[in-house]
């Protein structure tokens, strides 16, 4: 079954294809895409009650 | 921040055709998912689909057949069609756009459909 | 479609006290070390509004008294202290699997 747009890696997930640096993984269309195209969530306000978590938009190493 | 604003008709009848506009400002449709999701009386919420960054459609198969999601880069608008309505379509609809995880964290504040003869 | 199953239907609580929801999925909504399971609140008259992303994940602007637990099928929302704010629909929602889904929800009010 496809799976929807959780596009990217998280922190503690390794990516499922290699992608370029600047490219990004999108699980839904399930190919490296320019990782401006998809969306991070916002970003924690300093002293934010849980650790914020890399963006999940990472190139890959 | 992303704005989003649900337009279109508020009453259809039955076996017409729905069409909804979402207006975006903040951001460009040409990156992120563009979602549509609807909410019946008695509280459950249905996801419909979406529209991404590249054009690619999802469709939620329960309304495959009557469903189109469309959209118009130039106006940083895009759409929602449903065919054949009839009154179990009678809901308030909602544009949303999930970041990279599929959480959907900003939302129109929905346009209420009612079908009826 | 992966079902999720939220209880209590209906909660009231004291105002300072604990209020604990669940949302049980029909199958491991886990992939790739993320469990893609959220929370959002809705009161009457407005969208729905992310409170929890990945579980455990605080939006941002969302207080600390939110709270997010779980993986796999299991899940849990915590609100403490709850306030009178809080009064609510609390739904969860799956983003593992197409379709993707919501719970029935879970009305929260003050006792």
């Known amino acids: 079954m496809r799976r929807g747009p959780r596009s990217l890696r998280g922190r503690d997930a390794p990516a499922p294809t290699p992608c370029v640096p600047a490219e990004c993984f999108d699980l839904l269309v399930r190919h490296c895409v320019a990782c401006g195209l998809l969306r991070t969530p916002a970003p924690k306000p300093a002293g934010a009650s849980s650790p914020a978590p890399r963006t999940a938009l990472q190139p890959q190493e | 921040e992303v704005q989003l604003q649900e337009s279109g008709p508020s009453l259809v009848k039955p076996s017409q055709t729905l069409s909804l506009t979402c207006s975006v400002t903040?951001?460009?449709?040409?990156?992120?998912?563009w979602n549509w999701i609807r909410k019946f009386p008695g509280n459950k919420l249905e996801f419909m689909g979406y529209?991404?960054?590249?054009?690619?459609?999802y469709y939620n198969p329960s309304l495959k057949s009557r469903i189109s999601i469309t959209r118009d880069t130039s106006k940083n608008q895009y759409y929602l069609q449903l065919n054949s309505v009839t009154t179990e379509d009678t809901a308030t609809y909602y544009c949303a756009t999930p970041h990279t995880y599929g959480a959907m964290d900003y939302w129109g504040q929905g346009t209420t459909l009612t079908v009826s003869a | 479609d992966i079902v999720l199953t939220q209880s209590p239907v209906s909660l009231a609580v004291s105002l300072g006290q604990r209020a604990t929801i669940s949302c049980r999925a029909s199958?491991?909504?886990?992939?790739?070390?993320?469990?893609?399971m959220h929370w959002y609140q809705q009161k009457p008259g407005q969208p729905p509004k992310l409170l929890i992303y990945?579980?455990?994940d605080l939006e941002s602007g969302i207080p600390a008294r939110f709270s997010g637990s779980g993986s796999g099928t299991d899940f849990t929302l915590t609100i403490n202290p709850v306030e009178t704010d809080d009064v609510a629909i609390y739904y969860c929602?799956?983003?593992?699997?197409?379709?993707?889904?919501f719970g029935g929800g879970t009305k929260l009010e003050i006792k």
């Open positions: 990945r579980a455990s």
């Open positions: 903040g951001d460009s449709i040409t990156r992120g998912y």
């Open positions: 529209i991404n960054y590249s054009g690619t459609t």
């Open positions: 199958e491991s909504v886990d992939d790739y070390g993320i469990s893609f």
């Open positions: 929602q799956q983003t593992s699997k197409d379709p993707w889904t």
